[in-house]
């Protein structure tokens, strides 16, 4: 095959090599860009900047090599359009720094920066951390800072991400209230800050105020839906990004729903309770306090992270006729109480021949501490059990 005369020539089925001296000053309009998985660039002293627009349309790119060229600056968002990039070789260029944002969101298996006149500063603290943690093949490169010695020896005591403090109201928040949150940002080289409010949706009317170093946020006319929703303050500097999330607890009264008993692995009387703060629960059977034990007990389903409503079961291990009757769930919090009742019939009484007669069962009206503790299961956590002595 005749040698390729162009600035960039195909290499394999989805690669491109650009090695003709000085032929490129940008990466616009590369041939077959949308299918490229590998791009090799060498000896391009006029290629000094790499920016977002340069790599637009290179969505399949896996390997990018720009070596022995004039690269001085790589924009923090340069690789936004190349999310699959896994190998990045920028060795032997004129790079003095590289922002942590440049590689954020990429899953780089390899990052090569040797042969650049790097300038040791807090802006390279992230790279020093990669070196310490053995990431991306960085340790093997033994990176040097120009005239300053090894990157590994760079002092980093003052290189911290911003510190955030979010002030939330101490007092109880009620439905319809306005809530003011303030995010205080401290740290060196602050660049940007803001609020992330994606979870809020219709939970409140949002008004932002102020800027660095003190950001304000007013949540007006809050609803109970605001509970369990994250309000996040973020800030960035040259070292990295910090985020702090808070939740505003909006008080509202207890509510409860009961559903028909269902036979699953065991029998279950399903319920839903809501309220903030979380209501305390108590079961009655035929009007008397139901003693919970290991044979009849309240069991909650895994809670949804972003809502206050809790679903669960009064679980009965293979109940008999003595369990037939009226079940009432009482829920109460400081803002109100609610109850719901349901009749459950599990089994006919083997000793009753007249189905019209009442079942002769009486229950102790005395409450016990046998329900102490919240039997909520939290996945992927070692649960700390409640321990109660009875007798």
């Amino acid at each position: 095959a005749a040698p390729c005369p162009d600035a960039c020539c195909p290499h394999g089925s989805s690669g491109l090599r650009c090695t003709r001296d000085g032929a490129l000053d940008s990466l616009h309009h590369l041939p077959g860009a949308e299918n490229l998985t590998e791009l090799y660039i060498e000896n391009q002293q006029h290629l000094q900047h790499l920016e977002l627009r340069d790599l637009r349309g290179l969505g399949e790119l896996r390997n990018l090599t720009i070596v022995k060229s004039g690269l001085r600056f790589v924009a923090p968002d340069a690789f936004h359009f190349t999310p699959r990039l896994s190998r990045l070789n920028l060795s032997f260029n004129a790079l003095e720094s590289l922002s942590w944002k440049t590689v954020q969101g990429l899953s780089l298996q390899e990052l090569v920066l040797s042969g650049n006149p790097l300038h040791c500063s807090c802006a390279l603290r992230w790279l020093q951390r990669w070196e310490e943690e053995g990431l991306g093949g960085v340790p093997e490169q033994k990176l040097q800072c120009h005239g300053q010695g090894p990157l590994a020896h760079m002092p980093n005591a003052s290189c911290g991400v911003p510190t955030l403090k979010v002030q939330v109201p101490n007092a109880s928040v009620d439905v319809g209230d306005d809530v003011l949150l303030r995010c205080q940002v401290e740290g060196r080289g602050l660049e940007q800050a803001g609020w992330i409010l994606t979870e809020l949706e219709q939970s409140a009317t949002v008004m932002k105020s102020g800027g660095l170093p003190s950001l304000g946020l007013t949540l007006a006319n809050v609803t109970s839906d605001l509970n369990r929703k994250n309000v996040t303050c973020w800030a960035e500097n040259d070292v990295g990004r910090a985020e702090v999330s808070v939740q505003v607890n909006v008080s509202f009264p207890a509510s409860v729903q009961l559903h028909t008993a269902v036979e699953m692995h065991h029998w279950c009387i399903p319920f839903s309770v809501d309220g903030q703060p979380a209501p305390s629960l108590r079961w009655l059977f035929n009007g008397s306090v139901l003693n919970e034990t290991s044979f009849i007990f309240t069991e909650f389903l895994e809670p949804a992270a972003n809502e206050t409503v809790r679903h669960g079961c009064l679980r009965l291990n293979q109940p008999t006729h003595v369990n037939n009757g009226n079940y009432t769930l009482l829920a109460a919090n400081p803002f109100g109480q609610a109850s719901a009742s349901i009749m459950a019939a599990f089994m006919d009484n083997p000793f009753e021949f007249n189905p019209e007669d009442p079942i002769p069962v009486s229950f102790s009206p005395v409450d016990t501490n046998s329900t102490s503790g919240d039997p909520v299961e939290k996945k992927d956590e070692t649960p700390f059990g409640v321990s109660v002595a009875v007798g």
Epitope: H265, F297, S370, G373, E377
Partner: antibody, heavy 116, light 107 residues
Framework: EVQLLESGGGLVQPGGSLKLSCKAS????????LGWMKQRPGHGLEWIGD????????FYNENFKGQVTMSVDKSITTAYLQWNSLKASDTAMYYC?????????WGQGTTLTVSS | EIVMTQSPATLSLSVGERVTLSCKAS??????VSWYQQKPDQSPKLLIY???SRATGVPDRFTGSGSETDFTLTISSVQAEDLAAYHC?????????FGGGTKLEIK
């Protein structure tokens, strides 16, 4: 087939410590409470306590509170009953049992003898 | 705690006889009574739960009855393999408690 298999009993000196194991198999371990019973000749059965592997909740008989500790390793579906300072009155047969329809499955038991 | 009292302590019967074992609770246990059979050198086995429901695989000669504080286990026709101690227990309220047992001997 539901099975409960106890182990760890034996002869221990007064003041010694011991941990009995109860290996459960053949059912969804975290779906049932598990109880421990003590049986001494002429004393009938005594309920020590029970616990729920799913949540870690435990209930102790007041007579045994502070004397024994129940614990569980969900990953190996095994329950434990532990003493830190054994007394002669702890000499007995110990059973673990599943709380299903009543205590519907029992282990074969393990004998603990506390004697010098 | 609720005290469960069983009577008699020992019973000697011939094969084929009918037997009734008694269990009394010191207070209402709402029908939450179980009966267990314990053969010599074996662990207890559940016979009856909820005062009257037979556990899986239990022969129908075993019948439980009663409510509130008085409960009985009836064996309609005693067999040689019924030689055992029989325990009643309440699981209505913590702490769960058991009776002292009734020992059934075969003549």
């Amino acid at each position: 087939e539901v099975q409960l298999l106890e182990s760890g009993g034996g002869l221990v000196q007064p003041g010694g410590s011991l941990k009995l194991s109860c290996k459960a198999s053949g059912y969804a371990f975290t779906n049932y409470w598990l109880g421990w019973m003590k049986q001494r000749p002429g004393h009938g059965l005594e309920w020590i306590g029970d616990f729920y592997p799913r949540t870690g909740n435990t209930f102790y008989n007041e007579n045994f509170k502070g004397q024994v500790t129940m614990s569980v390793d969900k990953s190996i579906t095994t329950a434990y009953l532990q003493w830190n300072s054994l007394k002669a009155s702890d000499t007995a047969m110990y059973y673990c049992a599943r709380a299903g329809t009543g205590f519907d499955y029992w282990g074969q038991g393990t004998t603990l003898t506390v004697s010098s | 705690e609720i005290v469960m009292t069983q009577s008699p302590a020992t019973l000697s019967l011939s094969v084929g006889e009918r037997v009734t074992l008694s269990c009394k609770a010191s207070e209402n246990v709402g029908g939450y009574v179980s009966w267990y059979q314990q053969k010599p050198d074996q662990s207890p086995k559940l016979l009856i739960y909820g005062a009257s429901s037979r556990a899986t695989g239990v022969p129908d000669r075993f019948t439980g009855s009663g409510s509130e504080t008085d409960f009985t286990l009836t064996i309609s026709s005693v067999q040689a393999e019924d030689l055992a101690a029989y325990h009643c227990g309440q699981n209505y309220i913590y702490p769960f408690t058991f009776g002292g047992g009734t020992k059934l001997e075969i003549k």
